[in-house]
Each structure stands twice: as C-alpha cells, then as structure tokens.
C-alpha cells in the first residue's frame, strides 16, 4: 500500500475580482482496488447515497474529475446499496479520473479496498484518515472551487500545475 | 439542446455603460459555472469573465477589473455582464459560455455573441 | 499570466489530408487544454477538453494529445465542413487565455 500525496488546490476570488489559490499537502494510500497512479482534477464531493442511484445526472459530468466521499459509520448504513468498492466502480463510469474515500468513521472500509480483487479498477482509489481527511473535508465542505492533484510521489513543486 | 442567446448590444460612447444578457436554456442552470468571452474585430479571443453556480465568486483579467461586472439569476436563468467605464478597445462581439461541470475554466457551449460598439 | 503560441496561423490542406495544429503554453498547464473550431459568424465549437477527450457529439477523426507545455489538435482525413478557424484555450488557472488561432483552408 503505496503513499499517495494529494494536493488540494482552492480557487477563491474577492469581491474585486481578485483570484487566490491556496494549495493543501496532505497524504493517503493508494488501496488495491485501484491503480497506483497520478491523477488530477476538479473535486466533486460525492455522498455515499448519490451514489446508489442510477439517474440522469450521468451526462452531467466531463470525464476527469476527482470523487471525494466522506464514508460513515457502518451502523447508519447497515444495508449500503452498494460496497465501497462499488462506490468507487460506480464513480469511475461516471467519469471520475481518481476516487478518495474518507475512511475516519468507517475503518473496515481499508480492508475491503484493500481486499485483492481479480478486476482492480484502472483508476486511483485512495483513502484518507485522521487529520489528513480532515484537512480535506475542510476545503471540500466550504463547496469551493478546488482541485487535486494525486502523485505517487512527492510533488517536487507543489504549485506548479496551479500557479494562478 | 444547449442554448446561450445573448442580448444588449449596441453603440455606446467611451466613459458610458452597457448591459448585456444571456438567456440560457437546455440545461439546469444553477447547477453550471458561465462566462463571458470577448472576440475584436480581426482579432483573438479574451477571457472576460467567470462566476460560480451560486454567484459567490467572480474572476476578472486585470483588462476589465473594476470597470466590468458579471452576475447572474438563477431563477431566470439569465447571465449579466455590466459594462461600466468602456474604452474604445472594449469593442467587440462579447460571447456567454457555459462551463463544462465540473468547475469553472473550461467552456463547453457558446452563444453566438453580441456586438459591442465603443465609440464617439 | 500564460501565454498560448499557436502555429501555424495558416494552414492549406485538401479533402482527406491529416493535419495537426499546435500550441505551446509559456508553462506547464497540465491537462488544461481544451480545442475549438469556429466557422465565419458562428459561435465557437468545443472539440477535445482537457488534452484528450473528444467532446460528446464530435466526430472521431479529431484527436488531441501532448502535456506539459506542448498541444496538438490533429485532423485525420480532412472533410470539407473541417475547412475553419480553430483555436486552443489553456484553463489551468486564471486569467484563462487563448491561442491567437489557425485558419484552415483549402488548397
């Protein structure tokens, strides 16, 4: 289970027009059900349950982006739709170049990521916990612009695909 | 079918103001990024300006930071672009653009664009 | 802010010809680069977003590739309703900026 750093950038502007970035390192682990690669877009925050549906949102997305889903705790879901993995299948056919799961209050969650599948998705799974889902969660819950950026590496300069 | 149709256009003299609007159509509107793109005669294309889904957020280049004001209502469907201050060099066809979701850089649909004359 | 050189400014080319366009961003842009075409008074068509992905609608015979700082649209077997002016957009970070384009004609 291989390191993955994950750059979080945040587009925010002022009243003037003024734009900002803030740029976030934080780390997770790449899980078996995905591949070891690098991987960049826009964050999409991706509830558990919007997952379970098959709907028209389908062609809303460009193929691309980063999934960002704050698992919970297993006893409020005790009959999930859909495993975790699933999850992670079902946001990849939506288009999601990369999917990071926040495991903090779902820890079984690793085991079945990391459970050796015959058909590993072609796209970076990763999990965070602790403070680095924190930190996450921080910028994806203020629902501003942001990006990320996943290496299986540390990023040399950890602005160079932003610099605004 | 995605459809942007821009209105407002005209002649107007420097130091004078302008609106233009874009009614947009085909898709949830609420849900997308948009902006305005500026084409002169004979010339390239320039960024103009961007707002997020909700509003919160505008971009601007330094080119019309300060004289140019974009917004938006969801509830018609509608963009704004109001022009305060115009220069000569702000003639030209001024473009809505939808953003591809998601995020709020890249340009998906245009309209056909509007003319903007600046001059005395 | 980041410049977009696109080359060449011209292009002739006849029916069935494979043809690429290019444009160099002054820094690396990532995948931030879409493709457009533009007909004479119409509104610009989007063709490849983010380096390589053909948006939905478009035919197959436009491709796009490249990273870092160097872009390529390529055309394979030119159709007349091909004969335009396109033009490149990086969007990796604001302010977003364009190519100054390519007219495609026929020869």
């Known amino acids: 289970k291989e390191t993955a750093f994950v750059e979080v950038v945040l587009f925010e502007s002022s009243p003037s027009g003024d734009y900002t970035t803030y740029t976030t390192g934080l780390t997770g682990r790449f899980s078996r059900a995905g591949a070891t690669l690098s991987a960049e877009g826009e964050i999409v925050q991706m509830h558990p349950l919007g997952l379970c549906n098959n709907n028209d949102e389908e062609d809303l997305y460009e193929y691309g982006w980063v999934g960002v889903v704050k698992l919970e705790q297993p006893e409020l879901d005790p009959k999930p739709c859909l495993t975790v993995l699933g999850k992670a299948k079902r946001a990849v056919q939506r288009g999601a170049t990369a999917v990071i799961f926040d495991v903090s209050e779902n820890p079984e969650a690793i085991d079945q990521l990391n459970q050796g599948s015959e058909d590993p998705l072609k796209r970076p799974v990763v999990y965070v916990k602790g403070a680095d889902a924190i930190k996450l969660m921080n910028i994806v819950n203020k629902q501003k612009v942001a990006r990320a950026r996943i290496q299986h590496r540390p990023p040399r300069q950890p602005t160079e695909y932003f610099d605004m | 079918e995605v459809q942007l149709v821009e209105s407002g256009g005209g002649l107007v003299q420097p130091g004078r103001s302008l609106k233009v609007s874009c009614a947009a159509s085909g898709f949830t509107f609420s849900t997308f990024a948009m902006a305005w793109v500026r084409q002169a005669p004979k010339k390239g294309l320039e960024w103009v300006a961007t707002i997020t889904p909700g509003g919160s957020n505008t971009y601007y280049p330094d080119s019309v930071k300060g004289r140019f004001t974009i917004s938006r209502d969801n509830a018609k469907s509608t963009l704004y672009l109001q022009m305060d201050s115009l220069r000569s060099e702000d003639t030209a066809n001024y473009y809505c653009?939808?953003?591809?979701?998601?995020?709020?850089?890249?340009?998906?649909?245009w309209g056909q664009g509007v003319m903007v004359t600046v001059s005395s | 802010d980041i410049q977009m050189t696109q080359s060449p400014s011209f292009l002739s080319a006849s029916v069935g010809d494979r043809v690429s366009i290019n444009c160099k961003a002054s820094?690396?842009?990532?995948?931030?680069l879409n493709w457009y075409q533009q007909e004479l008074g119409e509104a610009p068509k989007r063709l490849i977003y983010?380096?390589?992905n053909l948006q939905t609608g478009i035919p197959s015979r436009f491709s796009g590739s490249g990273s870092g700082t160097d872009y390529t649209l390529t055309i394979s077997g030119l159709q007349p309703e091909d004969f335009a002016t396109y033009f490149c957009?990086?969007?990796?970070?604001?302010?977003?900026?364009f190519g100054s384009g390519t007219k495609l004609e026929i020869k």
């Open positions: 820094q690396n842009i990532g995948k931030y």
């Open positions: 957009l990086q969007h990796n970070g604001f302010p977003l900026t």
């Open positions: 983010n380096t390589n």
């Open positions: 653009a939808k953003c591809g979701y998601p995020g709020i850089t890249s340009f998906d649909y």
